[in-house]
Amino acid sequence: FERTRSLQDPCSNCPAGTFCDNNRNQICSPCPPNSFSSAGGQRTCDICRQCKGVFRTRKECSSTSNAECDCTPGFHCLGAGCSMCEQDCKQGQELTKKGCKDCCFGTFNDQKRGICRPWTNCSLDGKSVLVNGTKERDVVCGPSPADLSPGASSVTPPAPAREPGHSPQ
């Protein structure tokens, strides 16, 4: 089948990094500067992504692969292929419509992105607070008095964090 296809379509022989040039009798021509083709048999090359403004070049464009971008310091990537950059906040803050704001009492954020999450409620598990929470750190739950027997585990790790999103304004 491959041999039949290539007899019918000379373009199928053009490798990645080239395009099938209709203006030159369908011969394989190299992709022009600032363009690429990542698969064989293409009739055009795609324009390379330009990482400018808040975007930085993480990987240069080549004749066979597109450029890859990340974000300038103080920002982080969002979306498929880093299609957007969102500003970082400090630990203990979350990004709102009014910019970076401190976590309210009883909530924390230990990252530079995402939302402030409520401290773990130790009493729900029958535990006591071993280490108080802060804006940057969750509480650490310790044993309840009944657990203080030899061989009992002394510290329970906090509950896993919820998926980041944005709390209502």
Epitope: G53, V54, L78, M84, E86, K97, H166
Partner: nanobody
């Protein structure tokens, strides 16, 4: 080509005023939140203000609230930043940026950025 071009920067004395403009082209301007950022010499980028697609919501960083006003003219694909009572600490390169899809609903990511215009506040 999607493009943002800022203008209006310059040298101004403390207490003075400037109006920055941002001309947008290559996309449907009225469909996007728009944002101003700034970068002071030797410092990181700082968010200044942003404005909803129809201009009905505007938000400012605390340090410029009451002194700066963000506005837009969707008919002319233009974004503005009116800066009054300027201070030395407002000295920076000012950039306009386009909010990405879903801006303010699920994130505050930007995807298109201008080249910047320089504001210097000095006596």
């Amino acid at each position: 080509e999607v493009q943002l071009v800022e203008s209006g920067g310059g040298l101004v004395q403390p207490g003075g005023s400037l109006r920055l403009s941002c001309a947008a082209s290559g996309f449907t301007f009225s469909s996007y939140w728009m944002t101003w950022f700034r970068q002071a010499p030797g410092k990181g980028l700082e968010w200044v203000a942003h404005i909803k697609e129809d201009g009905s919501e505007k938000y400012y960083v605390d340090s410029v609230e009451g002194r700066f006003t963000i506005s837009r003219d969707n008919a002319n694909n233009s974004l503005y930043l009116q800066m009054n009572s300027l201070r030395a600490e407002d000295t920076a390169v000012y950039y306009c940026a386009r909010g990405g899809d879903g801006y303010s609903d699920s994130h505050y990511g930007v995807d298109v950025w201008g080249q910047g215009t320089t504001v210097t506040v000095s006596s």
